[in-house]
């Protein structure tokens, strides 16, 4: 960022999207602002319009190409600027030399589905979306299960330290409604962070068979 009152944070989804959030104290209310991306070794450049997400923070997505196209590599550096309209000109409000593979945040996992459910266990699978082939198997996952009467924040985190796109949940209560979420993170990148949580998958365990111990 240009100065201390401004915060400019961006993440690369590893394929064709850079998402940015810019926040500033006492920021301009009715001003049009944009993020400009200028790669050091590419012929293209890209712009997105910052839209308010709160009183002093704005966000936008730089769409670099088709969702699954590999638009940047580990050697790329992208100059990212926040530009705000003043009069007829643009003023640089924040700037950073962005190393995409040091600032990764993947898309949330998709296609969650129950593979098999029993009274006490449930096997769930998912897919990763728009993740670079560069990672090969160097990904980790976190999962959480929402039990009745609890909040997501209270749910214990289950860590999968390898690229494993399924989980077998054990010690569940029969005939009970649960929800399940998963998120993904590459092992690469100094400032890399977890993806957003997936959409929750609701499932119900099977009731215990009548006349049998549970």
């Amino acid at each position: 960022a240009v100065n201390g009152t401004s915060q400019f944070t961006c993440f690369y989804n590893s394929r064709a999207n850079i998402s940015c959030v810019w926040s500033q104290d006492g920021a301009l209310q009715d001003t049009s602002c944009q993020v400009h991306a200028w790669p050091d070794r590419r012929r293209w450049n890209q712009t997105c319009e910052l839209l308010p997400v709160s009183q002093a923070s704005w966000a936008c997505n730089l769409i670099l190409g088709a969702p699954d196209s590999q638009k940047l590599t580990t050697v790329d550096i992208v100059t990212l600027r926040v530009l705000c309209r003043e009069g007829v000109r643009w003023r640089v409000m924040a700037i950073q030399d962005f190393k995409p593979f040091e600032n990764l945040r993947l898309m949330a996992p998709i296609s969650l589905q129950v593979v098999h459910v029993e009274t006490h266990r449930c096997n769930i699978s998912w897919e990763i979306s728009q993740a670079s082939h560069y990672f090969e198997r160097h990904l980790e996952f976190e999962a959480r299960t929402l039990s009745p009467g609890h909040t997501w924040e209270e749910a214990p985190l289950l860590t999968l330290k390898q690229k494993q796109e399924w989980i077998c949940l054990e010690t569940l209560t029969p005939d009970t409604q649960y929800e399940f979420q998963v998120r993904v993170k590459p092992l690469q990148g100094e400032f890399t962070t977890w993806s957003p949580w997936s959409q929750p998958l609701a499932f119900r365990t099977k009731p215990a068979a009548l006349g049998k111990d549970t």
């Epitope: 240009v2 401004s6 007829v88 643009w90 640089v92 409000m93």
Partner: antibody, heavy 121, light 112 residues
């Protein structure tokens, strides 16, 4: 070599309008802003506003709003500043100046030679 | 609007001697991006203004290193280390941080 060449001196009556031109050369006209600055006789400099020839977008100093109109003709790389309802206080030298479209460093780097406008009955 | 006040109004100097011009703004001219867009322009007799200094202390291309700018917040100074004959003219400070952008009233530098 960057050059901004302005039209010649004008003498106008109070209430009339004047249109000053500024022809740019030596750079891509549509990549930079043209600012207009005036200097009343023996006085300081006053920023009037500016136009971005790339899209014709304008911004006027509140002091001149309603009386000033800035336009451009990209086919001949020329910017225009028209000031209406002239009064004697508008007697001044009017300058055009080039500025970067992104204000990273400075407002104006190259200036025209100035156009003297005299308002007298 | 930000009012820019320069002093002195007139500055008689001896060739080869230093000179200093002050510029004070009516409010802080640090832009919200952290930069201070304070510029100095010189208007030689019968000529158009030309840019000398931008962002308080940066010399524009071709400007001799005898010119230097300093200051912060609301108080700024232009210094000429050794005045030469070609330095004669009116010096204007200018703020580009807050629209409408405004000039100081000017300081006339002349040789004694």
């Amino acid at each position: 070599e960057v050059q901004l060449v302005q039209s010649g001196a004008e003498v106008k009556k109070p209430g009339a309008s004047v249109k000053v031109s500024c022809k740019a050369s030596g750079y891509t006209f549509t990549d930079y802003v043209i600012s207009w600055v005036r200097q009343a006789t023996g006085q300081g400099l006053e920023w009037m506003g500016e136009i971005y020839p790339g899209d014709g977008n304008t911004y006027y100093n509140e002091m001149f709003k309603g009386r000033v109109t800035m336009t451009r003709d990209t086919s001949i790389s020329t910017a225009y500043m028209e000031l209406s309802s002239l009064r004697s206080e508008d007697t001044a030298v009017y300058y055009c100046a080039r500025g970067s479209y992104t204000y990273d460093n400075y407002a104006m780097d190259f200036w025209g030679q100035g156009t003297t406008v005299t308002v007298s009955s | 609007d930000v009012v820019m006040t320069q002093s002195p109004l007139s500055l008689p100097v001896t060739l080869g001697q230093p000179a200093s011009i002050s510029c004070r703004s009516s409010q802080n001219i640090v832009h919200s991006n952290g930069n201070t867009y304070l510029e100095w322009y010189l208007q030689r007799p019968g000529q158009s203004p030309r840019l000398l200094i931008y962002k308080v202390s940066n010399r524009f291309s071709g400007v001799p290193d005898r010119f230097s700018g300093s200051g912060s917040g609301t108080d700024f100074t232009l210094k000429i280390s050794r005045v030469e004959a070609e330095d004669v003219g009116v010096y204007y400070c200018f703020q580009g941080s807050h629209i409408p952008w405004t000039f100081g009233g000017g300081t006339k530098v002349e040789i004694k």
